[in-house]
């Protein structure tokens, strides 16, 4: 039994880091393998992660972390029984994938304006809380070419757009994702999408 693709890990910079790897053949990850992880720090002890299958030869492990700070560093040991298959390290702050924003809502009751709001996925005491920026994706269910991205570079989790920038009388969907420049993170996953019917009064055309 050998590791074909070494574990790579990303952290949500809150409580979970996710590590993925591939074995050289079909593997029952949960019965055959264990990933031990230990914070490199005074009086820390190793924790055991039981991996799950992720495709035939792929494995994924969700490492639970009680806290995360910029200086954290973990040792990782992948075991198959008594055999050490791989040894490595992981610094969560260097591999951050933020949590996806939640509670995306489209408010259509403001005249001729669409207000999109969502929730910051971090609590106020987390470092990322004040460092997230967002991308909002809006698309038409009827027209695949009607697809747009709005970059929200301010901290407030909201976006206002004129209803008239979208076609009237058709349904749209929106979703939002986040990233943090401070840690050069990857983008989060997209939030679940939300749907609304766009309708507004067309201005009378003057001839």
């Amino acid at each position: 039994m050998k590791v074909l693709q070494e574990p790579t890990c990303v952290s949500d910079y809150m409580s979970i880091s996710t590590c993925e790897w591939k074995m050289n053949g079909p593997t029952n990850c949960s019965t055959e393998l264990r990933l031990l992880y230990q914070l490199v720090f005074l009086l820390s002890e190793a924790h055991t992660c039981i991996p799950e299958n992720n495709g035939g030869a792929g494995c994924v492990c969700h490492l639970l972390m009680d806290d995360v700070v910029s200086a954290d560093n973990y040792t990782l040991d992948l075991w198959a029984g008594q055999q050490l298959l791989w040894k490595g390290s992981f610094k969560p702050s260097e591999h951050v994938k933020p949590r996806a924003p939640g509670n995306l809502t489209v408010h259509t009751n403001v005249s001729d304006t669409l207000l999109l709001t969502w929730s910051n996925p971090y609590p106020p005491d987390n470092y990322l809380y004040n460092h997230l920026t967002y991308a909002v994706n809006i698309w038409s269910e009827n027209d695949p070419a009607d697809f747009r991205i709005y970059n929200v570079t301010y901290l407030e989790p909201s976006l206002r757009i004129a209803a008239s920038t979208l076609k009237s009388g058709i349904s749209y969907r929106a979703r939002v994702r986040a990233w943090a420049q401070c840690y050069n993170t990857t983008w989060s996953e997209w939030s679940p999408s939300t749907k609304w019917h766009n309708s507004y009064r067309e201005p009378f055309e003057q001839h």
Epitope: L42, L43, S44, D67, V69
Partner: antibody
Framework: EVQLVESGGGLVQPGRSLRLSCEAS????????MHWVRQAPGKGLEWVSG????????GYADSVKGRFTISRDNAKNSLYLEMNSLRPEDTALYYC???????????WGQGTLVTVSS | DIQMTQSPSSVSASVGDRVTITCRAS??????LAWYQQSPGKAPKLLIN???RLQSGVPSRFSGSGSGTDFTLTINSLQPEDFVTYYC?????????FGQGTRLEIK
């Protein structure tokens, strides 16, 4: 509510022994490392000893190494400090403290006073 | 052993003032530094952890900064209950060591 209650202090002659206890409640005791910190009358804080969740890792201050032994009983939510060959300079208020995983003591007991004198 | 040197050892100030206490480590301790407040006859109370994180329940007038060897604790708009003793503590390596303390007195 986290509570740490120390006991076992008292007046003891130089060269004798004493065993301190700390009873913990309000948190999952076996998830955290624990420590003893002392403070001589009118002086600053001095770290004495600490041990990890399952006692696989232990540290001592040079001043107590070889004389003091730290231990814990996770089933009883209790921390102990066995103090042998006590010296007058060990006279202090001994605090039990919970380790906050990133190098800080987030909860402290009220302390138990150890006086070493003939 | 890592020596922690606090300065000043005592400082006089008035209610409403801003005070800064510094702590210097004899070698690099990254961000593994905490600050405590101790009132007479009481156990120490954690104020700041990992150099700059405010402990839950601690008033926002307290703040910490620094990394490596130089750290500061700042108290803005001093309140009467702040006139007590403050300690820094490193946890980069054993033995864990504290600064000698800074006593904050009313002017």
């Amino acid at each position: 509510e986290v509570q740490l209650v120390e006991s076992g202090g008292g007046l003891v002659q130089p060269g004798r022994s004493l065993r301190l206890s700390c009873e913990a409640s309000g948190f999952t005791f076996d998830d955290y490392a624990m420590h003893w910190v002392r403070q001589a009358p009118g002086k600053g804080l001095e770290w004495v000893s600490g041990l990890s969740r399952t006692s696989v890792s232990i540290g001592y201050a040079d001043s107590v190494k070889g004389r003091f032994t730290i231990s814990r009983d996770n089933a009883k939510n209790s921390l102990y400090l066995e103090m042998n060959s006590l010296r007058p300079e060990d006279t202090a208020l001994y605090y039990c403290a919970k380790w906050g995983t990133r190098g800080y003591f987030d909860y402290w007991g009220q302390g138990t006073l150890v006086t070493v004198s003939s | 052993d890592i020596q922690m040197t606090q300065s000043p050892s005592s400082v006089s100030a008035s209610v409403g003032d801003r005070v800064t206490i510094t702590c210097r480590a004899s070698q690099d301790i990254s961000i593994w530094l905490a600050w405590y407040q101790q009132s007479p006859g009481k156990a120490p109370k954690l104020l700041i952890n990992v150099a700059s994180r405010l402990q839950s329940g601690v008033p926002s007038r307290f703040s910490g900064s620094g990394s490596g060897t130089d750290f500061t604790l700042t108290i803005n708009s001093l309140q009467p209950e702040d006139f007590v003793t403050y300690y820094c503590q490193q946890a980069n390596s054993f033995p864990i060591t504290f600064g000698q303390g800074t006593r904050l007195e009313i002017k």
